[in-house]
């Protein structure tokens, strides 16, 4: 993906990252529309929509990383998320199906905005990494494992299982972005200082 222009202002960049992660932990932007579109909006089914442990790095893991390592892990995990979202998008209803099924077009639009939004976040991650590389204080790069593997769907016997897998994945994604937001909130006022 093409990298957009980067702000040289650490505080501006951190503010943008915090704003983006705030939006991405909001389930009304991705998980909730997915649940409605896939017909999973039933209490019994919602219970099955819990992430599989280990699919995403934990908040504890993220907190243990240096800032560069954290950005690397975040970038790598979002790369996996992009692939998985592309796969989910293939299975979404097309515009032609909407009127025939009465589905909310707003829900479908929210789902299709997820990938562009993540690309925007990754652009700012790249910019922040550049900024940290140019700051005078070196910090050991302690990269995390990222998601243990790209969060891959378990072999699904049918479409319904795939829908549940997608639901669990998105649940985990929102939880992960919540953790990311909490880590960013602890970052210091300058690229040289970190509040622990």
């Amino acid at each position: 993906a093409a990298i957009g222009s980067c702000s040289k202002e650490y505080r501006v960049l951190l503010g943008q990252l915090q704003k983006q992660t705030d939006l991405m932990q909001d389930t009304s932007r991705l998980l909730d529309p997915y649940i409605r579109i896939q017909g999973l909006d039933v209490p019994k089914l919602r219970e099955h929509c819990r992430e599989r442990p280990g699919a995403f790095p934990s908040e504890e893991t993220l907190r243990g990383l240096g800032r560069r390592g954290f950005l690397q892990t975040l970038n790598a995990t979002l790369g996996c998320v992009l692939h998985r979202l592309a796969d989910l998008e293939q299975r979404l209803p097309k515009a032609q199906d909407l009127e025939r099924s009465g589905l909310n077009i707003e829900d479908l639009e929210k789902l299709q905005m997820a990938r562009p939004n993540i690309l925007g976040l990754r652009n700012n991650i790249y910019c922040m990494a550049q900024l940290l590389d140019n700051s005078d204080t070196a910090e050991p790069t302690k990269a995390g494992r990222g998601a243990s593997q790209p969060p891959t769907p378990t072999p699904a016997s049918d479409a319904f299982q795939r829908k549940l897998e997608g639901c669990r994945f998105l649940h985990g994604y929102h939880r992960f972005m919540h953790s990311v937001g909490r880590v960013f909130s602890k970052w210091g006022e300058s690229p040289n200082r970190s509040r622990r």
Epitope: R36, D41, A95, E99, S101, G102, L103, N104, E109, M113
Partner: antibody, heavy 117, light 111 residues
Framework: EVQLQESGGGLVQPKGSLKLSCAAS????????MNWVRQAPGKGLEWVAR??????????YYADSVKDRFTISRDDSQSMLYLQMNNLKTEDTAMYYC????????WGQGTLVTVSA | DIVLTQSPASLAVSLGQRATISCRAS??????????LHWYQQKPGQPPKLLIY???NLESGVPARFSGSGSGTDFTLNIHPVEEEDAATYYC?????????FGGGTKLEIK
Amino acid sequence: EVQLQESGGGLVQPKGSLKLSCAASGFTFNTYAMNWVRQAPGKGLEWVARIRSKSDNYATYYADSVKDRFTISRDDSQSMLYLQMNNLKTEDTAMYYCVRYDWFAYWGQGTLVTVSA
Amino acid sequence: DIVLTQSPASLAVSLGQRATISCRASKSVSTSVYNYLHWYQQKPGQPPKLLIYLASNLESGVPARFSGSGSGTDFTLNIHPVEEEDAATYYCQHSRELPWTFGGGTKLEIK
């Protein structure tokens, strides 16, 4: 086959009331957002009101020209859509159509409302 | 409210030729995903009939001589080749935000 059948139109005096009904069949009514659209004689089309489905908490929306006078409602168990019209004005004279979704692939034949002294 | 302005108000086109109707919105009716603009045909004494939805999607059962294009604020309905039965009034409608509005209509006459 999708069918929408409006009824309840007629002649009413200004400031009077009327309740329009729309019987829906041939589709799963309760999953759809439904709308009323009207057309004054010899004029263009005007969206009037919208009601969403249960999953969207039956949210309702109105054109400014009918706000606080008209009420859209639905009965999913009977696959019925309603438009309660109060404090009618001469400019409410129109053919009223019941239509489904955000773009209107299915229309009823309409019911004519005439507001006149 | 978003105002949709159609032009021309009326036009006469010879059988087999192309009819082009424009719909201009007072502000964008598009997002990065969809163009929320739809086209209808109405004949006297009948309810309107959906031709095109989301700017360019042909409704099922509508002849392929109808096509729609455009994004943002400028949209076009093309009919080619025009046939006798296409004599009607054509309306655009947006569903970008409430209140939804219609254009004023374009009356097509076949010469």
